[in-house]
């Protein structure tokens, strides 16, 4: 969490941003809140990016003002206009790409004063893993697949029965570049699996951590997946 204040004491307002991550090929949200004003026409929101000459987005007098917008962001940005009055200056970014990563500044002007806060925005790819029993294998084998990751993640297997065991010797992980030549498909195979046990396939990079669990008994197979973003720090 980053909390920024205006420069001149009495005329400063609190602006708060949260470091976040964007999944490339989807819309992303850059979070920013501020002390609200009672009059929408008195609020100015400017989003800037370090190293970019033009503005990322500007909202003033109750509407978008995009004449100074940088070409890189043309047609891709929006604030939640109906929520500005309650202090939400968050930015929606369409079709996030790797190049959108960087340091952004949320700069606010209201009748109470000015304030700003920086936000670190990471971009990458992350997806839910799916763990299945590989019936084609000669021994009891589990196969963990996740379609899109970037940067290259680490993959670790764990088991409920053998807690703390190191499965690196009995697993094999491969990374296959996807057609857009950025993200990769993750495939990890775990050998010598025992029945009546819960196994977890944990995939992690500096942006996200995802876990796929599978419980194999003689009568049924139960699966569960979970994904968590790692870098949500507020400023």
């Amino acid at each position: 969490l980053i909390i920024g204040f205006g420069i001149s004491g009495r005329h400063s307002i609190t602006v708060t941003t949260v470091a976040s991550a964007g999944n490339i090929g989807e819309d992303g949200i850059l979070s920013c809140t501020f002390e609200p004003d009672i009059k929408l026409s008195d609020i100015v929101i400017q989003w800037l990016k370090e190293g970019v000459l033009g503005l990322v987005h500007e909202f003033k007098e109750g509407k978008d003002e995009l004449s100074e917008q940088d070409e890189m962001f043309r047609g891709r940005t929006a604030v939640f206009a109906d929520q500005v009055i309650v202090g939400n200056a968050s930015l929606r970014l369409k079709n996030v790409q790797l190049t959108d990563a960087g340091t952004y500044k949320c700069y606010i002007i209201t009748s109470k004063g000015k304030g700003n806060a920086n936000l670190e925005y990471k971009t990458g790819a992350f997806s839910m893993p799916e763990v299945n029993v590989d019936y084609n294998a000669s021994s009891e084998t589990l196969r963990c697949e996740a379609p899109r990751w970037f940067p290259q993640p680490t993959v670790v297997w764990a088991s409920q029965v053998d807690q703390g065991a190191n499965f690196s010797e009995v697993s094999n992980t491969s990374f296959e570049l996807n057609s857009e030549n950025v993200t990769m498909k993750v495939v990890s195979v775990l050998y010598n699996v025992t029945i009546n046990n819960t196994y977890s396939c944990m995939i992690e990079n500096d942006i996200a951590k995802a876990t796929g669990d599978i419980k194999v008994t003689e009568s049924e197979i139960k699966r569960r997946s979970h994904l968590q973003l790692l870098n949500s720090k507020a400023s």
């Epitope: 090929g25 989807e26 978008d64 047609g75 604030v79 369409k94 079709n95």
Partner: antibody
């Protein structure tokens, strides 16, 4: 040249299924938001479905649960699987690329007629 | 659900005249996510304007877009014979993800 070419339309009975294809050239389908948009005879444009660059999908309420959008990255091709077809699904179906700032590339359209 | 209402439904003008087409949204739309398309009979739509006011590649400068919030306008400063067609506005970002207006037919007077 950047191009989209649809195929797979035709005459189908109510309740039937059809799969539309959209072959792309000159750009990579998986880097863009790819859409299906339809136009009933004499009517306006109606958005049907999107597949994001990430592979996630979204649908108009009118087709949710009946239509499935997908893509084959190796073939650079977009698909629309249409099941439980109804008379009101009769339309010209266009695939369109949204290159961040609007649907800038459209196919020529393929006609789907649902009639008994 | 955001509804886009275009007016007039039909606009009858002569070549050389100025055309003003309106698109009104039922709730606020980001200027970035507002586009205009032209469609001629038997053809696919063509992107004219994106981001409410930016001309798409290859679009003549007689076409211009303006507006913000809930009111957007497409202006054709001097009508050419090839400009007579149906025009649609479209928004992105709400549910449904994309919404089109019902269209304005620009016909020769």
């Amino acid at each position: 040249e950047v191009q989209l070419v649809e195929s797979g339309g035709g005459l189908i009975q109510p309740g039937g299924s059809l799969r539309l294809s959209c072959a792309a050239s000159g750009f990579i389908v998986s880097r863009n938001y790819m859409n299906w948009v339809r136009q009933a005879p004499g009517k306006g444009l109606e958005w049907v479905s999107v597949i994001y660059g990430s592979g996630r999908t979204d649908y108009a309420d009118s087709v949710k649960g009946r239509f499935t959008i997908s893509r084959d990255n190796s073939k650079n091709t977009l698909y629309l699987q249409m099941n439980s077809l109804r008379a009101e699904d009769t339309a010209v179906y266009y695939c369109a690329r949204d290159a961040d700032y609007g649907m800038d590339v459209w196919g020529q359209g393929t006609t789907v007629t649902v009639s008994s | 659900e955001i509804v886009l209402t275009q007016s007039p439904g039909t606009l009858s003008l002569s070549p050389g005249e100025r055309a003003t087409l309106s698109c009104r949204a039922s709730q606020s739309v980001s200027s970035s996510y507002l586009a205009w398309y032209q469609q001629k009979p038997g053809q696919a739509p063509r992107l004219l304007i994106y981001g409410a006011s930016s001309r798409a590649t290859g679009i003549p400068d007689r076409f211009s877009g303006s507006g913000s919030g809930t009111d957007f306008t497409l202006t054709i400063s001097r009508l050419e014979p090839e400009d007579f067609a149906v025009y649609y506005c479209q928004q992105y970002g709400s549910s449904p993800l994309y919404t089109f207006g019902q269209g304005t037919k620009l016909e020769i007077k």
